[in-house]
Interface confidence: medium
């Protein structure tokens, strides 16, 4: 049986970014027809992960896993009946709590982003890492880069692979 | 608001193992009163991740995230009413699909383990990585090591931190 996943292409891109392997990221982005400016924007985010070392990738992977499997994420999907849920509702749509986090990572202030992460994982080392990554992204990315990253996310969320 | 997570101590241990940082792993294991033989068993698993490099940790992190956020995991928890779910059922218990995967990783054959991973993430590179890790664990761990790892998992699943 092949199980449905919550927006698999999103997680493919996230882990390719956090991994620091440009080739893996390119393969994932090709699947959603990313433009050159969108690729550049994602690679700038990728550079922040790789520059801050393995621990940064692991801690942020932990945050992503925690949010994705949190009651908040699961709870949001359970506005429908159990049968509905089993059929379709939750199957492939990305959880709103994950979306919120990604949006704040790009468009929020460092404090807003760290505050959202703290709702899910309050370990000081995790929060410090979140702030470092956010500061790096703000230093590296222009407003145009951030708009391109957001437009790529729209492509991901609306992709048949999500 | 501090959200409930699905068995946070389990994910802390998983990411500490996959990270290859002995200190982080020791800190996590101390929280569940791990014995010396249990620690040794977990460090043997950790060695397999470290030996297979960054890509191994990233791909296995992707598998864990995918299973944890899959319809299979979420669906299993939704046998109760929505209200029940929001209160308690899903809050902190580890998803049975994750448990199954971990059990097969330790006690199954490589084929059984890879087949279970394939239900969630069928990318060839992911499946090849799963087989490499499984073969490594089988080569490194004695039967006694595996029993110790399973007893540690029981401690994790029944811990107040789960």
């Amino acid at each position: 049986v092949k199980m449905a996943e919550t927006c698999p292409i999103f997680y493919d891109v996230f882990f390719a970014v956090a991994n620091g392997n440009e080739l893996l990221l390119d393969l994932s982005l090709t699947k959603v027809n990313a433009t050159e400016p969108e690729r550049t924007a994602m690679k700038k985010i990728q550079d922040c992960y790789v520059e801050n070392g393995l621990i940064s990738r692991v801690l942020d992977g932990l945050v992503m896993t925690t949010i994705s499997s949190s009651k908040d994420c699961m709870g949001e999907a359970v506005q429908n009946t159990v049968e509905d849920l089993k059929l379709n509702t939750l199957g492939r749509e990305i959880c709103p709590a994950v979306k919120r986090g990604v949006d704040l990572f790009l468009t929020g202030t460092p404090d807003e982003y760290v505050e959202q992460v703290a709702q899910y994982k309050a370990l000081p080392v995790v929060l410090e890492n979140a702030r470092i990554l956010k500061n790096c992204v703000d230093a590296k990315m222009t407003e145009e880069d951030k708009e391109n990253a957001l437009s790529l996310l729209d492509k991901i969320y609306t992709s048949p692979l999500c | 608001v501090k959200m409930a997570e699905t068995c946070p101590i389990f994910y802390d241990v998983f990411f500490a193992v996959a990270n290859g940082n002995e200190l982080l792993l020791d800190l996590s294991l101390t929280k569940v009163n791990a014995t010396e033989p249990e620690r040794t068993a977990m460090k043997k698993i950790q060695d397999c991740y470290v030996e297979n490099g960054l890509i191994s940790r990233v791909l296995d992190g992707l598998v864990m995230t995918t299973i944890s956020s899959s319809k299979d995991c979420m669906g299993e928890a939704v046998q109760n009413t929505v209200e029940d779910l929001k209160l308690n059922t899903l809050g902190r218990e580890i998803c049975p699909a994750v448990k199954r995967g971990v059990d097969l990783f330790l006690t199954g054959t490589p084929d059984e383990y890879v087949e279970q991973v394939a239900q969630y993430k069928a990318l060839p590179v992911v499946l090849e990585n799963a087989r490499i890790l499984k073969n490594c664990v089988d080569a490194k761990m004695t039967e006694e090591d595996k029993e110790n790892a399973l007893s540690l998992l029981d401690k994790i699943y029944t811990s107040p931190l789960c």
Epitope: E22, R131, I132, C136 | -
Partner: antibody
Framework: QVQLVESGGGLVKPGGSLRLSCAAS????????MNWIRQAPGKGLEWISY????????YYADSVKGRFTISRDNAKNSLYLQMNSLRAEDTAVYYC?????????????WGQGTLVTVSS | EIVLTQSPDFQSVTPKEKVTITCRAS??????LHWYQQKPDQSPKLLIK???QSFSGVPSRFSGSGSGTDFTLTINSLEAEDAATYYC????????FGQGTKVDIK
């Protein structure tokens, strides 16, 4: 073994241009991020630019932004630095340096450097 | 831009003595801090990566510690060949070097 050899340095007038090259050998060049770092005579190290393994992302220090361009040719195992609108304060030894794979350590191997002198 | 400040600027030490060099970042950089040694007329060499990880082939007398904003390079039992300038580099957000610390032998 890892080897990085810079070339292209020399004397140039203010406002002039120069192109530095770095020939890499002993490793799979296309897997690694690469940097240019400089050191003015008797002074400390200054990072000026780096480029991702595939060449699609580049970064610059504010002091050279808009004047210098980093690029690479993975087929030729070569890294380049195009320097335009040169100033006296750009006089320095220019080093190319490799990052560890997946950026696991910045500047794990360096070349011997090439001297650029900007003077009228 | 993240600014790194090293101290001291200069240190004169007798052989077998312990040397401590500090590097302070203007904002938290986690463990993304690296140490280099540069001897006269040579290119720099990586000693310590990510605050505390020894680079391959580096003698065990060199060690690093710290995280966040405060970092330390320690040379236990200085040898004559350790006379050099030592630099810290942050890689958390782009890259910047400290101004350097010159160590010479008394």
């Amino acid at each position: 073994q890892v080897q990085l050899v810079e070339s292209g340095g020399g004397l140039v007038k203010p406002g002039g241009s120069l192109r530095l090259s770095c020939a890499a050998s002993g490793f799979t060049f296309s897997d690694y991020y690469m940097n240019w770092i400089r050191q003015a005579p008797g002074k400390g190290l200054e990072w000026i630019s780096y480029i991702s393994s595939g060449g699609s992302t580049t970064y610059y220090a504010d002091s050279v932004k808009g004047r210098f361009t980093i690029s690479r040719d993975n087929a030729k195992n070569s890294l380049y630095l195009q320097m335009n609108s040169l100033r006296a304060e750009d006089t320095a030894v220019y080093y190319c340096a490799r990052d560890g794979k997946y950026n696991t350590s910045p500047g794990d191997y360096w070349g011997q450097g090439t001297l650029v002198t900007v003077s009228s | 831009e993240i600014v790194l400040t090293q101290s001291p600027d200069f240190q004169s030490v007798t052989p077998k003595e312990k040397v401590t060099i500090t590097c302070r970042a203007s904002q938290s950089i986690g463990s993304s801090l690296h140490w280099y040694q540069q001897k006269p007329d040579q290119s720099p060499k990586l000693l310590i990566k990510y605050a505390s990880q020894s680079f391959s082939g580096v003698p065990s007398r060199f060690s690093g510690s710290g995280s966040g904003t405060d970092f330390t390079l320690t040379i236990n039992s200085l040898e004559a060949e350790d006379a050099a300038t030592y630099y810290c580099l942050q890689s958390s957000s782009l890259r910047t070097f400290g101004q350097g610390t010159k160590v010479d032998i008394k």
